[in-house]
C-alpha cells in the first residue's frame, strides 16, 4: 500500500466591510501549515449585503444588524462546519460610520451595538465591531495589494526568506465617503499623522498615507449637487436632457455638506433640477472641492495635507476602478494618460441624455453621475495628489490582484490574525538538501 | 409599425466571410440601436455586438472581436453583420434586433432570422 | 465574466403559477428582460425593465428582481405560454448584453 497524501487543512476568516453605501462580506481561506507565505491568503467566496450601508439604519438600528443576515447565512454554508468555531469573524466600518459619529455619536454606538447582537448569534469566533481610522483604511488598503502581489518577500530556492527587488505598490481607493492615498516614501513626513512605520517579514517599510473624508464618490457626488443648487439652479456634470427631482433634506443631512446649507430651508422641499451636458462649467464646479491656494508645509496636495511627491507604481480600486473601466469598456474610450483621460471625461460629460442612454443599454441608476465622478478622479489625481503624465504611467487601475477583491478589508485581516510576521521565520520547516 | 428584414438564408466554406443585411421597413434608425444575436442548433441566444447608426458606436462580445464587423447606412435604413474566418460552430439563425430608447435600449422588435450554414 | 443561469425546464400545471428564475451575481443591481420564444420564431420580449409589461403582452406576466435572482412570474398558464424564455442583462463591466441559457416551459393538462 501506499500512503496518500491528506491535501493540506484550510483556515478560514470572515470580513464585513461595511462601508457608506453597502456591506459586502468576504470570506478568505488560506492552508494552515503555510501561514507566514506571502500571497497565501486568497479570497475564498463574497457577498453583497442588500440594501444600504450601516449607517443608513440610525434611525432603526436593529435593521443593520438584521440586513447582514443573508450574507452570514451565506458564510455558513461557506466555510466547513467543522471549521465554524476556528474561523474569525470582523467587521470593519469605514467613513459612513466616521461621519455619523460627527453628528450622533448615540446612534452610531447603538448601530455597532445591533451588529455585534447579530454577529455573536453566529457559530463563528467574532472579534468585534469596530471603526477604523482613515489611516487604517488606506495602510490596510495598501497591505493588501502589496501580499496579494508578492511584493513583500519571495521564497528562495535555498529554503530561505529573500526579499524581493521590486518595491511596493501605491494604493489609491475610492470609496463612497472617502478616498485614501498610501505609498512607501523615503522622505520623513513633514505631519506625524500622514507617517505610518511597519515591519513586515523582517523589512521596514516607511509609508505615507492619507484619508480624506467627504471626498468619497457618494458625498461628492452630494457637495457637487449643493453647489449646483446654490451657483447654477442647473447641473452641468448631469446629461442634457434628464432631470430628476431633488429632496433638499437629503441633500444637506450630510456634514460633507453643512458648509453649503442655505441658513433656512423647507426640509421637505423638493427641487427640479435638469442636467445641461457642460463639461467645462462642471470642470470648474468640480475644482472647488479642492483647495490648492494654502500649505502650511513643504509640499502638499490640497486642503493643507502635507504629502511627498507620489513615487512608484499605483493601483487604483473600487470607484477608480468602475469608473475609469467605464470611460474605456463603454465609452470606447483611451484613459492610458492623464490628457487622455481628460478627453474622455469631457467627451462623456458633453453626452446627452439620450446618447448616454444608447450606448448603455438596460441601465440607468448611476449613469447620470459618471461625467461627474470622472471629473473629480482626473481633478484629484493631477491637481490634488500631483501625478503629471510621466508618474501617471505609473498607475493601474483593477479591482482584483490574485482573484482577490483589493481592498482594505484583506490587509485588516492579515494584521488581526498575525498572519504577516514582523520578522523573518526561521529555517523552513522540511527543507532538506540532499 | 417598424419591422426588421433579413437578407436571404447563406452557405458558406469554412474560412470564408458572410455578410448578412437588416432593414428596418416602415422607420429609420433615428435614436434607435440594433444588436445582432445568433442562435445555434438547440441552443440558446448569443449576442455578438451592437450600432448606434446616429452616433456612429460600435461594441462587439469579446468572443467576436476581430472576427464581427457591424455598420449601419442610414440612407437606406440598413444595418450589416459580417463575420469572417467562419468555421463550422458558426452554423446558426443570425438574428438582427432592434434596441428601443422605450424600453432602456432592449431588443422590441426582431426579424425571423438569417439562417448561416457552415459546411465544407 | 458575468453570467446569468435559468433552470433547464420548468413545468406547470394548466391554470397555474409558473415562475422561472434567473440568477446572477447582485441582479438586483441591473436592469432584467425576459423574452419568450416559441419553436421555429424570433423572441419576443415580454417583460422590460424587471417588471415591466410591453403593450400586448398580458397582464399575466409579471417580474421582480432583488439580490441575486430575477423571478418571471406567469400566472394562470396556458398552453400557449409553452415556449422557451430567456433573461437577459447588460453587463456594464464587459459592455455587453448576457443572456440566460433558457427555460423550456412546460404548461401540463
Known amino acids: 500500500t501506499q500512503d496518500v497524501r491528506e491535501p493540506p487543512a484550510l483556515k478560514y476568516g470572515i470580513v464585513l466591510d461595511a462601508g457608506s453605501s453597502h456591506t459586502s462580506m468576504f470570506v478568505y481561506k488560506w492552508p494552515a501549515d503555510k501561514e507566514n507565505d506571502t500571497g497565501i491568503v486568497g479570497q475564498h467566496s463574497s457577498c453583497d449585503v442588500r440594501g444600504g450601508g450601516i449607517s443608513s439604519y440610525a434611525n432603526d438600528p436593529s435593521r443593520a444588524g438584521q440586513s447582514l443576515v443573508e450574507c452570514l447565512e451565506q458564510a455558513l454554508r461557506d466555510v466547513p462546519k467543522d471549521r465554524y468555531a476556528s474561523t474569525p469573524l470582523y467587521l470593519g466600518a469605514t467613513a459612513g460610520m466616521r461621519l455619523l459619529n460627527l453628528t450622533s455619536p448615540e446612534a452610531t454606538a447603538k448601530v455597532l451595538e445591533a451588529v455585534t447582537q447579530t454577529l455573536t448569534r453566529y457559530p463563528f469566533d467574532f472579534r468585534g465591531a469596530r471603526i477604523l481610522s482613515g489611516q487604517d483604511e488606506g495602510v490596510f488598503g495598501w497591505v493588501t495589494a502589496n501580499y496579494l502581489l508578492e511584493n513583500f518577500i519571495k521564497y528562495g530556492w535555498v529554503g530561505r526568506w529573500i526579499r524581493p527587488r521590486k518595491g511596493t505598490l501605491g494604493a489609491m481607493d475610492l470609496g463612497g465617503a472617502s478616498t485614501q492615498i498610501t505609498f512607501e516614501t523615503t522622505s520623513p513626513s513633514e505631519d506625524p499623522d500622514n507617517e505610518v512605520h511597519l515591519r513586515l517579514y523582517g523589512q521596514h517599510y516607511r509609508v505615507y498615507t492619507h484619508s480624506f473624508l467627504c471626498y468619497g464618490r457618494d458625498q461628492v457626488l452630494q457637495r457637487l449637487l449643493a453647489s449646483a443648487l446654490q451657483i447654477h439652479r442647473f447641473h452641468p456634470c448631469w446629461p442634457k436632457g434628464y432631470s430628476t427631482q431633488v429632496l433638499l433634506r437629503e441633500v444637506y443631512q450630510s456634514p460633507c455638506t453643512m458648509g453649503q446649507r442655505p441658513q433656512t430651508f423647507n426640509s421637505s422641499a423638493t427641487v427640479s433640477l435638469s442636467g445641461t451636458s457642460n463639461a467645462a462649467l462642471c470642470r470648474d464646479l468640480v475644482s472647488g472641492l479642492f483647495n490648492i491656494s494654502s500649505c502650511p508645509f513643504s509640499q502638499c496636495s490640497f486642503n493643507g495635507v502635507f504629502q511627498p511627491p507620489v513615487a512608484g507604481n499605483f493601483i487604483a480600486f473600487s470607484a477608480f476602478y468602475y469608473t475609469v473601466d467605464f470611460l474605456k469598456t463603454v465609452m470606447g474610450l483611451p484613459v492610458g494618460t492623464l490628457k487622455q483621460l481628460e478627453d474622455a471625461t469631457e467627451t462623456t460629460c458633453n453626452q446627452t441624455w439620450a446618447e448616454l442612454q444608447a450606448r448603455v443599454p438596460g441601465q440607468q441608476t448611476r449613469l447620470p453621475d459618471y461625467c461627474a465622478v470622472a471629473m473629480f478622479i482626473h481633478q484629484l489625481l493631477s491637481r490634488g495628489y500631483r501625478f503629471d503624465e510621466r508618474s501617471f504611467r505609473g498607475v493601474v487601475f483593477e479591482k482584483k490582484a490574485a482573484d482577490t477583491a483589493v481592498g482594505w478589508a484583506l490587509g485588516y485581516m492579515l494584521n488581526l490574525t498575525n498572519l504577516i510576521p514582523a520578522d523573518l521565520p526561521g529555517l523552513r520547516k522540511g527543507t532538506h538538501f540532499s | 409599425q417598424v419591422q426588421l428584414v433579413q437578407s436571404g438564408a447563406e452557405v458558406k466554406k469554412p474560412g470564408s466571410s458572410v455578410k448578412v443585411s437588416c432593414k428596418a421597413s416602415?422607420?429609420?434608425?433615428?435614436?434607435?440601436?440594433v444588436s445582432w444575436v445568433r442562435q445555434a442548433p438547440g441552443q440558446g441566444l448569443e449576442w455578438m455586438g451592437r450600432i448606434v447608426p446616429w452616433l456612429g458606436f460600435t461594441r462587439y462580445a469579446q468572443k467576436f472581436q476581430g472576427r464581427v464587423t457591424i455598420t449601419a447606412d442610414e440612407s437606406t435604413s440598413t444595418a450589416y453583420m459580417e463575420l469572417s474566418s467562419l468555421r463550422s460552430e458558426d452554423t446558426a439563425v443570425y438574428y438582427c434586433?432592434?434596441?428601443?430608447?422605450?424600453?432602456?435600449?432592449?431588443?422590441?422588435?426582431w426579424d425571423q432570422g438569417t439562417l448561416v450554414t457552415v459546411s465544407s | 465574466s458575468y453570467e446569468l443561469t435559468q433552470p433547464l425546464s420548468v413545468s406547470v400545471a394548466l391554470g397555474q403559477t409558473a415562475r422561472i428564475t434567473c440568477s446572477g451575481d447582485a441582479i438586483g443591481e441591473k436592469y432584467v428582460y425576459w423574452y419568450q420564444q416559441k419553436p421555429g420564431q424570433a423572441p419576443v420580449l415580454v417583460i422590460y425593465?424587471?417588471?415591466n409589461r410591453p403593450s400586448g403582452i398580458p397582464e399575466r406576466f409579471s417580474g421582480s428582481n432583488s439580490g441575486n435572482t430575477a423571478t418571471l412570474t406567469i400566472s394562470r398558464a396556458q398552453a400557449g405560454d409553452e415556449a422557451d424564455y430567456y433573461c437577459?442583462?447588460?453587463?456594464?463591466?464587459?459592455?455587453?448584453?448576457?443572456f440566460g441559457g433558457g427555460t423550456k416551459l412546460t404548461v401540463l393538462g
Open positions: 425593465d424587471d417588471n
Open positions: 437577459a442583462s447588460y453587463d456594464l463591466q464587459q459592455a455587453r448584453w448576457v
Open positions: 434586433a432592434r434596441e428601443s430608447p422605450g424600453y432602456r435600449y432592449s431588443f422590441d422588435v
Open positions: 416602415g422607420g429609420t434608425f433615428d435614436s434607435y440601436a
